[in-house]
């Protein structure tokens, strides 16, 4: 079970929203806090530690889910071409 | 099967650009991210650099880095290297490579192309 | 870089294991690829167990604590050529960057 703790969103800059959100789950033995259909989950650590992030389907349905080269996150882009970039901190 | 055909080799001069192409076939190209590695006359595997599926992010190796832009062609299935400010140590075959799954490392790649030699020299 | 040795014989039917070792711990696993003269590498081992399914099931990958092995339990002929290692290499300046060992020349008598 998980809960959003905070979430900030940032408009200023054109074309581009910044959010930031925390999320609090209680969570099984061997998992741990993720995202899964764009919205808090518990997930296997095993994806956390290797950074395997599109392992967690953490897309919308329909999306399709790209790992950053550098693993620092993923990004979910959608039928009509949209990138959603999210960064894990 | 999977088929990658790369072209654009061949004798290329000193301080000069090349444009290399990686023609896919087989699979859903959008779906994988790609990557160059190159191999010098008589030398083992060097890694060259990836792309992700949309091609908005790429890395590269240190080797290339500055002089090397990776791209690809979704509706044509189609991925490209570009590199300037050739040197004869970028003498070597490029191979096109696919990653297995939704990420490619030097551990995942599960196809690779023919390879197509580039010579740098005057 | 990784390390693996340069060569290893062996007699037709008998099980081969080349070893590799370094790179960073990505969660990626390791990869093995097989390249004769003149062709290019071809993937028998990728993500430390995974087999194309056009190579033989006498390929295997496994993962010991740092040590990679790639075994060949019954070489063929065929089977001789040199064997890279792949796997990741992390540093501050480039981020994760793949790395490859320098070759494994298996010879098969």
């Known amino acids: 079970t998980c809960e959003i703790v905070t979430l900030d969103r940032d408009s200023s800059q054109p074309r581009r929203t910044i959010a930031r959100q925390t999320a609090r789950c209680a969570c099984r033995k061997g998992q741990i806090a993720g995202t899964t259909r764009a919205r808090p989950a518990c997930v296997d650590a095993r994806i956390i530690k290797t950074k395997q992030w599109c392992d967690m389907l953490p897309c919308l349905e329909g999306e399709g889910c790209d790992l950053l080269i550098n693993r620092s996150g993923w990004t979910c882009t959608q039928p009509g071409g949209r990138i959603k970039t999210t960064t894990v901190s | 099967a999977v088929t990658l055909d790369e072209s654009g080799g061949g004798l290329q001069t000193p301080g000069g650009a090349l444009s290399l192409s990686c023609k896919a076939s087989g699979f859903t190209f959008s779906s994988y991210q790609m990557g160059w590695v190159r191999q010098a006359p008589g030398k083992g595997l060097e890694w060259v650099g990836v792309?992700?599926?949309?091609?908005?992010?790429?890395s590269y190796g240190s080797a290339v880095k500055g002089r090397a832009t990776i791209s690809r062609d979704n509706g044509q299935s189609t991925l490209y290297l570009q590199m300037n400010n050739l040197r004869a140590e970028d003498t070597a075959v490029y191979f096109c490579?696919?990653?297995?799954?939704?990420?490619?490392?030097?551990?995942?790649?599960?196809?690779w192309g023919h390879g197509t030699e580039v010579i740098v020299s005057s | 870089a990784l390390t693996q040795p340069s060569s290893v014989s062996a007699n037709p039917g008998e099980t081969v294991r080349i070893t590799c070792s370094g790179g960073?711990?990505?969660?990626?696993?390791y990869g093995w690829y097989q390249q004769k003269p003149s062709s290019a590498p071809l993937t028998v081992i990728y993500k430390d167990d995974e087999r194309p399914s056009d190579i033989p099931s006498r390929f295997s990958g496994s993962s010991s604590g740092s040590t990679h092995t790639l075994t060949i339990t019954g070489v063929q002929a065929e089977d001789e050529a040199v064997y890279f290692c792949?796997?990741?290499?992390?540093?501050?300046?480039?981020?994760?960057?793949?790395?490859f060992g320098a070759g494994t020349t298996l010879t098969v008598l």
């Open positions: 490579a696919k990653g297995s799954a939704s990420y490619i490392t030097a551990a995942t790649i599960d196809a």
């Open positions: 792309i992700n599926k949309s091609g908005s992010d790429t």
């Open positions: 960073a711990s990505s969660g990626y696993g």
């Open positions: 792949g796997n990741d290499d992390y540093s501050s300046d480039s981020g994760y960057v793949g790395v």
